[in-house]
């Protein structure tokens, strides 16, 4: 009764496209498949950065398989070829472990990179992000801003760079189609004629850092003696009304601060017959709905009401 | 099913070039990557050059800055420029393409015979 064995796939490695950060992992199949012709074998693929505590495992059946990956840190990967038990009249086989790794060779310090990168998609419209220079670096340092997401052809370079002192630290983007909902990518890296310069890898999705414009249109209605009614409009912009969070700061007199949450554009609020003057503010943010994280908006303009005046107008009603 | 077809080998000096031609024919719905390998008998095959997923090319070993791959996606064919040959070079290139078939759902690897280069003087 002879064991089956099966030969782990051939030239495995890791391509780097050039997209800054999303990598191939490719293979092709084990030598001496003959026998399992009629056998459809399986890959499992197991991948992470350097250091990570966990894999991240795939069965495929296919010869390659794509993500993104933080090029700041090295890549190790492993595939092994599985032959399901359908093959073997038993149980299933596995192949020994095929490894490939990749990084890319770091130039200059940890200290030169750029220094707090923040990035801002401002109203869903316009990405702006900003960096401050590397410690210790001179001022022939300059940075350069590349990106990426799926369904550029090609990395590209920022165009419209801001400046201080001739010097880029941040970048204005131009309108970017279709880039929301999947990783954005982005390599700042930097040339000087005294000292290498660190390159710096970014992922995230546009959707996430989000910051809206502030409501705009505030009113009050008195709905009964002791209730009021607040009201707003959304922000002008792409940003449909489902996607909205909003933050109110109630005043009463200048003493009561009320703040609540509220997913629409109204607010009912209980007053006390004590109460002369009603002042609020809101703020917008994107929701848990359309993402994951986001900005609040600036407050909008402060709005006050004296309550008689809101009563006269509710008894002419 | 699916054939591939090499063409372009030969013999040659030291110094010269050649342009390798693999065309590929048959039941194939999508070619994902595309290769040239090299083997010398008794040794292990190696890749010398590749366009693989997004069209990005990748060279390997002596390969870099002396042979140009590239591929002609209306033929269904890649090519391979070999200039600056050593006799090192001296090696069976076979033609190398992952693919779908039109029957099927996931890819496979397909190979041509190969064609014999020769560097000598």
């Known amino acids: 009764d002879t064991e089956i064995k099966v030969n782990p796939p051939q030239d495995f490695e890791i391509v780097d496209p050039g997209y800054l950060g999303y990598l191939y992992l490719q293979w092709q199949p084990p030598l001496s498949l003959d026998n399992f012709k009629e056998c459809t074998v399986e890959y499992e693929l197991k991948y992470r950065n350097i250091g990570s505590e966990t894999w991240t495992t795939i069965i495929t059946k296919n010869l390659h398989y794509k993500d993104g990956f933080d090029l700041n840190k090295g890549i190790e990967a492993k595939i092994h070829t599985l032959l399901p038990w359908q093959c073997t009249n038993g149980s299933e086989v596995q192949s020994s472990w095929a490894e490939a790794t990749y990084w890319i060779s770091p130039q200059g310090i940890p200290e030169t990179k750029v220094q707090d990168m923040d990035c801002v998609y401002y109203n869903w419209q316009y990405l702006l992000c900003s960096w401050k220079p590397g410690i210790g670096v001179l001022l022939d340092t300059n940075y350069n801003l590349f990106y990426w997401y799926e369904g550029l052809d090609r990395a590209l370079q920022c165009v419209d760079y801001i400046k201080v002192d001739g010097q880029n630290i941040g970048c204005r983007f131009p309108y970017l189609e279709s880039s929301d909902y999947k990783d954005f990518y982005i390599c700042v890296n930097g040339s000087s004629e005294t000292k290498p310069i660190r390159s710096s890898y970014f992922t995230f999705q546009l959707q996430n850092i989000v910051k809206p414009l502030p409501p705009v249109c505030l009113t009050c209605t008195q709905e009964s003696l002791y209730e009021i009614k607040l009201k707003w409009s959304i922000p002008l912009g792409p940003i449909p009304a489902r996607c909205f969070v909003y933050e109110i700061e109630i005043r009463e007199d200048d003493t009561t601060l009320v703040t609540t949450t509220v997913e629409n554009e109204t607010y009912t609020l209980k007053i006390t017959n004590e109460t002369r003057q009603l002042c609020f503010v809101v703020r917008s943010k994107v929701n848990i709905y359309c993402s994951d994280d986001g900005i609040w908006s600036e407050w909008s303009d402060k709005q006050c009401w004296e309550v008689e005046e809101l009563l006269k107008k509710t008894l002419l009603l | 099913q699916v054939q591939l077809q090499e063409s372009g080998g030969g013999l040659v000096q030291p110094g010269g070039s050649l342009r390798l031609s693999c065309e590929v024919s048959?039941?194939?719905?999508?070619?994902?990557?595309m290769a040239w390998y090299r083997q010398v008998p008794g040794k292990e095959r190696e890749m010398v050059a590749q366009?693989?997923?997004?069209?990005?090319?990748k060279y390997y070993g002596s390969a870099k800055g002396r042979f140009t791959i590239s591929k002609d996606s209306a033929k269904n064919a890649v090519y391979l420029q070999m200039n600056s040959l050593k006799p090192e070079d001296t090696a069976v290139y076979r033609c190398?393409?992952?693919?779908?078939?039109?029957?099927?759902?996931?890819?496979?690897?397909?190979w041509g015979q190969g064609t014999q280069v020769t560097v000598s003087s």
């Open positions: 190398n393409i992952v693919g779908v078939l039109t029957t099927g759902h996931y890819e496979n690897s397909f």
């Open positions: 048959g039941s194939i719905s999508s070619i994902n990557r």
């Open positions: 366009i693989t997923y997004g069209d990005t090319i």
